[in-house]
Amino acid sequence: SSHMAPTHQLPPSDVRKIILELQPLSRGLLEDYQKKETGVPESNRTLLLCLTSDSQPPRLNSSAILPYFRAIRPLSDKNIIDKIIEQLDKLKFQHEPETEISVPADTFECKSFILTILQQFSACLESVFKSLNSGPQ
């Protein structure tokens, strides 16, 4: 809920530190996946609601993103995904339940699902980083 304080109640300076850590992890993961799975299209059935709609500037909606990374962890680079999860945990809001995400059973759909998550997450980070850089919080 919008009125709950984040677990670590981070100032913008520390949110920025986390975004800076996440950007290369996310980029690297996406690039490696695109190289490995050439020709896989982005899914139009997956929408990562990665930004909070109730704050200005927008914040990363960690509680909405985490279940997706937990779901794709067994099917992707576990080491990098663990690092991403560790950072996202720092941004997580207290008491917000994580919804369970199920990965498509079909192999091709699954690959498309993973690619879409990685692409949308990278775009989200870019958006949040720009907002953190554009003047007063």
Epitope: A5, P11, P12, S13, D14, L20, E21, L132, P136, Q137
Partner: antibody, heavy 118, light 111 residues
């Protein structure tokens, strides 16, 4: 006990580059955030930037075009390089550790005085 | 950038009396009820030393004579009672927003 020790040249010529070393003992630079701050004559303190446990850097926008912070994890040292220095860069330079528990800097080096002069 | 304005620039206090230093930020440095404002002491020829973190928390090993208060944009460092060893310059610092900024310093002397 965490200790930070700055070292480097005390005199640099205008237009040249300044490179300082911060040697850390009692903690690993592969955890946490490691900062550079300077104090000008007249006592004004300026935050310069940091290098993180993973090697990510972030700089004060006022210095962005001239500053590089790097590290050597095998030596547990991190470095400040400042290019195209002018007399305005004459200052005492400090390295410091960022304390996550308090969101402040809990350990500082003793500082190294740098004069930019021809 | 958040501008930190410290006052007074210098302060002369008798031994055993109270010293009060103020710091005002150009915008709030609070989030979710926590203030990201800190105080440092710097003695001549030494490096800055953390006294108070997050507005009112006493750093380990710092005597209870030092206290911090305030929220939002207005903060205060109090030393009571002042001792001879407290002669130093005191700085406030915000780590709320990048780039981090500092106050101009307050030089404490003994009357």
């Amino acid at each position: 006990e965490v200790q930070l020790v700055e070292s480097g040249p005390s005199l640099v010529k205008p237009g040249g580059s300044l490179r300082l070393t911060c040697s850390v003992t009692g903690d690993s630079i592969t955890s946490g955030y490691w900062k550079w701050i300077r104090k000008f004559p007249g006592n004004k303190l300026e935050y310069m930037g940091y290098i993180s446990y993973s090697g990510i850097t972030d700089y004060n926008p006022s210095l962005k075009s001239r500053i590089t912070i790097s590290r050597d994890t095998s030596k547990n040292q991190y470095y400040l390089q400042l290019n195209s220095v002018t007399t305005e860069d004459t200052a005492t330079y400090y390295c410091a550790r960022y304390a996550n528990y308090g969101y402040a800097m809990d350990y500082w080096g003793q500082g190294t005085s740098v004069t930019v002069s021809s | 950038d958040i501008v930190m304005t410290q006052s007074p620039a210098s302060l002369s206090v008798s031994l055993g009396q109270r010293a009060t230093i103020s710091c005002r930020a150009s915008e709030s440095v609070d989030t979710y009820g926590r203030s990201f404002m800190h105080w440092y002491q710097q003695k001549p020829g030494q490096s800055p030393k953390l006294l108070i973190y997050r507005a009112s928390n006493l750093e380990s090993g710092i005597p209870a004579r030092f206290g911090g208060s305030g929220s939002g944009t207005d903060f205060t460092l109090t030393i009571d009672p002042v001792q001879a060893d407290d002669v130093a310059t005191y700085y406030c610092h915000q780590s709320y927003e990048d780039p981090w900024t500092f106050g101009g310093g307050t030089k404490l002397e003994i009357k």
